[in-house]
Amino acid sequence: EPPTACREKQYLINSQCCSLCQPGQKLVSDCTEFTETECLPCSESEFLDTWNRETRCHQHKYCDPNLGLRVQQKGTSETDTICTCEEGLHCMSESCESCVPHRSCLPGFGVKQIATGVSDTICEPCPVGFFSNVSSAFEKCRPWTSCETKDLVVQQAGTNKTDVVCGPQDRQR
């Protein structure tokens, strides 16, 4: 009886169970009653990452420098090229087809997590007791100055955008 299902790493064609091609190789010819599946390695700029019956290998991804991309990991016959973004840029999407500049955290916000090649800057509002007076992709919220430790008093309260202003204590005569 001809098979209706095949083992793992096989496929059914013309009532025959044929071996799939291993990762890094493409199908040249299906198996027959007389022959095993014929496979050929992908060329240098191509890959296939699964056991397959593809007659064409996939082209490696191109990391286009005009889109701010560079190669993070060179592709092999079994893996695609992995692109990442140049310094100061991050991927626009998960597939990283182009890059955009990291965003800066506006005054009143500090950097919670510095951007990487694949993720944007994460900002957080400065909580009470902290401030940020710059627009920056690196600066965290800084604590207000402690006037007391300098033997000074608060002359102007701090905000999330400004530090406190300290001044001398009024001396009582």
């Epitope: 025959q16 071996s19 040249v28 010819s29 009653e33 007389f34 007659t55």
Partner: antibody, heavy 115, light 112 residues
């Protein structure tokens, strides 16, 4: 239905070349290798080699590597075998054959090499 | 090259008899994929060969079940349980495990 059509006979002079044809029909030509087999009276059968019409890739019996050239014309679904520097030893019936989902043979071309 | 040796060269039988043809190879025909690419076919006078059995024991579509193949490694047998007139001709074994593919010399099945 699958058919492999071959001319019935060819008569050629010693030292000359001949190009035998095998026209395929009834299936997708590029999906299956075409193989060639030689049969001389009282000498049994010999496998010459095969060609993959998809990419023109060949595999050969070393014995026939310098004698036979295998090609295909995808536009006409025809496989060819050219035999060169013919001698009386090349006089034989030449079959083309295809397998995969059944085995199919042409009717054979009788090649006579004679002056 | 793998040498395929068929015996007998000639096999006279009476119609209705059982016939048995042997084929031995000079090396194992077990492929690394687990298949054994040993095949049988029949050639009648003036005709192209007609395949009967592939991979030792699998009958091609339309081949009567009186034909059966068996064996492994280097030793193979084709049996015809009840010979009919249409079965007469030359039987060949062939192997496609190793390149070049090779054929047995043939066994002529004829009437006693």
């Amino acid at each position: 239905q699958v058919q492999l059509q071959q001319p019935g006979a060819e008569l050629v002079k010693p030292g000359a070349s001949v190009k035998l044809s095998c026209k395929a029909s009834g299936y997708t030509f590029i999906s299956y290798y075409i193989y060639w087999v030689k049969q001389r009276p009282g000498q049994g059968l010999e496998w010459i080699g095969g060609i993959n019409p998809r990419n023109g890739g060949t595999n050969f019996n070393e014995k026939f590597k310098s004698k036979a050239t295998l090609t295909v014309d995808k536009s006409s679904s025809t496989a060819y075998m050219q035999l060169s520097s013919l001698t009386s030893e090349d006089s034989a019936v030449y079959y083309c054959t295809r397998h995969g989902n059944g085995v199919y043979w042409g009717q054979g071309t009788t090649l006579t090499v004679s002056s | 090259d793998v040498v395929m040796t068929q015996t007998p060269l000639s096999l006279p039988v009476s119609l209705g008899d059982q016939a048995s043809i042997s084929c031995r190879s000079s090396q194992s025909l077990l492929h690394s994929n687990g298949n054994t690419y040993l095949h049988w076919y029949l050639q009648k006078p003036g005709q192209s060969p007609n395949h009967l059995i592939y991979q030792v024991s699998n009958r091609f579509s339309g081949v009567p079940d009186r034909f059966s193949g068996s064996g492994s490694g280097t030793d193979f047998t084709l049996k015809i349980s009840r010979v009919e007139a249409e079965d007469l001709g030359v039987y060949f074994c062939s192997q496609t495990t190793h390149v070049p593919w090779t054929f047995g010399g043939g066994t002529k099945l004829e009437i006693k």
